[in-house]
Amino acid sequence: MASAGMQILGVVLTLLGWVNGLVSCALPMWKVTAFIGNSIVVAQVVWEGLWMSCVVQSTGQMQCKVYDSLLALPQDLQAARALCVIALLVALFGLLVYLAGAKCTTCVEEKDSKARLVLTSGIVFVISGVLTLIPVCWTAHAIIRDFYNPLVAEAQKRELGASLYLGWAASGLLLLGGGLLCCTCPSGGSQGPSHYMARYSTSAPAISRGPSEYPTKNYV
């Protein structure tokens, strides 16, 4: 029962992680720039994401522009896009694997196979968590490096956007949820056969010892 509870908790966490990851990838808030004009009284915030950039004026008016050419984009942005999409697809695959092996489904009847599928889904979720973490940490590293680079102009310096925090949360939830699913399989994987072997070995001496005792009893 506790195992089933942990499984449910693990899946809930990974689902939350997946949603967070989706929002993080979609929102144009990876890098945030605050421009405060020196000569003219202009205040605007620029949000940069993986797919578009937005300018928010001090009036509250917002204008967004989707990046035009894929080939014209910086390689790190292309890589971040790819990793984000791959991470989300990997997590979806993990969910399908989990559903196939979940205790409440009948896709697979054999307990051992079910446990193995749950364990596999856990590993897949952990991989997804790591894949989510890479572009987020890479972007954060670039922002921080620019911040401390004296030759990067103040206007070019960025701050960590909300998407990065969502990305970290998504990664953490996927890793935690995947970890829980990996831990809820005492009868799965390599532990399964040894568990059954132990049951046979306890009863085997009684069966084998019986016939050897009968002759002695008969002779007495």
């Epitope: 910086p74 790190d76 670039a142 004296p150 030759l151 990067v152 102009a153 103040e154």
Partner: antibody, heavy 119, light 107 residues
Framework: EVKLVESGGGLVKPGGSLRLSCAAS????????MSWVRQTPAKRLEWVVT????????YYPDSVKGRFTISRDNAKNTLYLQMSSLRAEDTAVYYC????????????WGQGTLVTVSS | DIQMTQSPSSLSASVGDRVTITCRAS??????LAWYQQKPGKSPQLLVY???LLVDGVPSRFSGSRSGTQFSLTISSLQPEDVARYYC?????????FGSGTKLEIK
Amino acid sequence: EVKLVESGGGLVKPGGSLRLSCAASGFTFNSYTMSWVRQTPAKRLEWVVTISSGGGRTYYPDSVKGRFTISRDNAKNTLYLQMSSLRAEDTAVYYCIRGDYRYDGFAYWGQGTLVTVSS
Amino acid sequence: DIQMTQSPSSLSASVGDRVTITCRASENIDSYLAWYQQKPGKSPQLLVYASTLLVDGVPSRFSGSRSGTQFSLTISSLQPEDVARYYCQHYYSIPYTFGSGTKLEIK
């Protein structure tokens, strides 16, 4: 108009010391990162040192670390470069440079002051 | 340290010609590259930063581009006032280093 005027250059013997000054005007001095870059007789440019707007952070290449010291007096709108243990390879025109709010790199250059290290 | 290899070291072209100066970084520097112009007897001037962005007031015939670790400064139509030395410089990490320079002359 941004104006950067270097002074203090001259002839010095190897192992000697020299202090360069850069008088800044036409902008709010304490708002900008300042640097020194030198140009050798062979016309090669070499970054020497950079100091943050407040003066709290300084950045040096290994070639001058421990020998050169950058400082600034924001009240006097002046940048300094204290050079010691000078070598022949330090012979160059030294430029005082101001960073910019919008542009990366070395945005505004002074006219330079010549430092000659020779016996 | 990151080495910046600039080529050619000198270049002679006619007015109206398209001129390209290249600079290769010894390792990845992203787009942290600036180009400077130094006219005879003058101090260097910033032309391009972040590998492709032009400083205000710089004629539009100047353009910067990047392909991996190779960077280019192109003058689409050479003018007499473009006679100068051109330097590339990276500011990816300390120490910041410059290319050896390209001396551009008019034929």
